[in-house]
Interface confidence: low
């Protein structure tokens, strides 16, 4: 009988988030490992032959950029191991035996947010990565908009924007004559309970997009008759 060597408790924790395309960003909290040690995470694919990807930690972060042929798919499944050298010997720890990227999604923010002012409303349009276009219907957006001089904490929000890459802000939602700013973020939509597990994505909101500035359109209200009209 052999007693296992306890390698814990481990005070480090790892968080790895994917943009659901070709990038996995990892962040860790750990005691200093000392000079000369270059720790890394190793992602070993359970799906693809040759699917081993090294993530060299610089400070508390590392990023894996997958080759184009390894674009992430819902069935992807990795084992993550943590490697570092101590006293000239490599130490290996198991981080996650079953890392499912689709359960740890943080998408890149929408890009190319633009405004188009028409009489009575403003049309906002934006772009997503071409790699995400097949899952357009799974993307949920949140819009924040405000007067330019206001802080983002005071912004109005519109959420549950699903499956589209444009929306209309009506003039009555804006303050006429003022310059406004809008920004957008995206996440994988929360699906109904009857969706099969293999198609279920979870994660967090992306960072906010670069804001777009626009002049609020004039309101097209009904003409108000002068006093005294019958």
């Amino acid at each position: 009988s052999v007693t296992g060597e306890g390698q814990g408790p481990r005070s480090r924790t790892f968080t790895c988030l994917t943009n659901n395309i070709l990038r996995i960003d990892c962040h860790w909290s750990a005691p200093e490992l000392g000079q000369g040690s270059s720790p890394w995470l190793l992602f070993t694919s359970n799906q693809a032959p040759g699917g081993t990807h090294k993530c060299i930690l610089r400070g508390s972060e590392c990023t894996v950029v997958l080759p184009p042929e390894a674009v992430l798919v819902p069935s992807d499944n990795f084992t993550i191991t943590f490697h570092h050298c101590m006293s000239g010997r490599e130490q290996v720890s198991l981080v996650d035996p079953e890392y499912l990227p689709r359960r740890h999604v943080k998408l890149d923010p929408p890009s190319d947010l633009q405004s188009n002012i028409s009489s009575g409303h403003c049309i906002l349009t934006w772009s997503i990565s071409p790699a995400l276009e097949p899952m357009t219907t799974l993307l949920s957006y949140e819009l924040a908009f405000k007067k330019q001089e206001e802080a983002w904490e005071q912004a109005q929000h519109r959420d549950h924007i699903v499956g589209v890459t444009w929306l209309i802000l009506e003039a009555f939602e804006l303050d006429p004559g003022f310059i406004h700013e809008a920004r957008l973020r995206v996440q994988m939509a929360t699906l109904e309970d009857d969706v099969v597990e293999e198609e279920r994505y979870t994660g967090q909101w992306s960072e906010w997009s670069q804001p777009v500035c626009f002049q609020a359109p004039q309101r097209q209200g009904p003409l108000i008759p002068p006093w005294g009209w019958p």
Epitope: G4, E5, G6, Q7, G8, P9, R10, T13, N46, N77, S93, L94, V95, D96, P97, E98
Partner: nanobody, 117 residues
Framework: QVQLQESGGGLVQAGGSLRLSCAAS????????MGWFRQAPGKQRELVAV???????NHADSVKGRFTISRDNAKNTVYLQMNSVKPEDTAVYYC???????????WGQGTQVTVSS
Amino acid sequence: QVQLQESGGGLVQAGGSLRLSCAASGSIFSINAMGWFRQAPGKQRELVAVISSGGSTNHADSVKGRFTISRDNAKNTVYLQMNSVKPEDTAVYYCLVATRGGTYEYWGQGTQVTVSS
């Protein structure tokens, strides 16, 4: 504390088979994953195969199609069936148990597997 009992290592001819076993006992109520790593002389310790509590398995590319990891949850035992072994499979094989959340992990002392050509 977790106790690990490894068995099954030894000398085998290239093309032959071996079955490694690792039984865990002790504070095993929170075991998340069990698996095998190996370390050949002068080389880094590497993942061979791992199996999660849910039964999902992961095998290193170098052993896919030849080695199979399995687990008997009732016995808290993990197995590594090694078929069509090659001289480059010669290494010390270590059993690994990791608890849920990755707070603790335990390693066996290792069992030697030698493949002769």
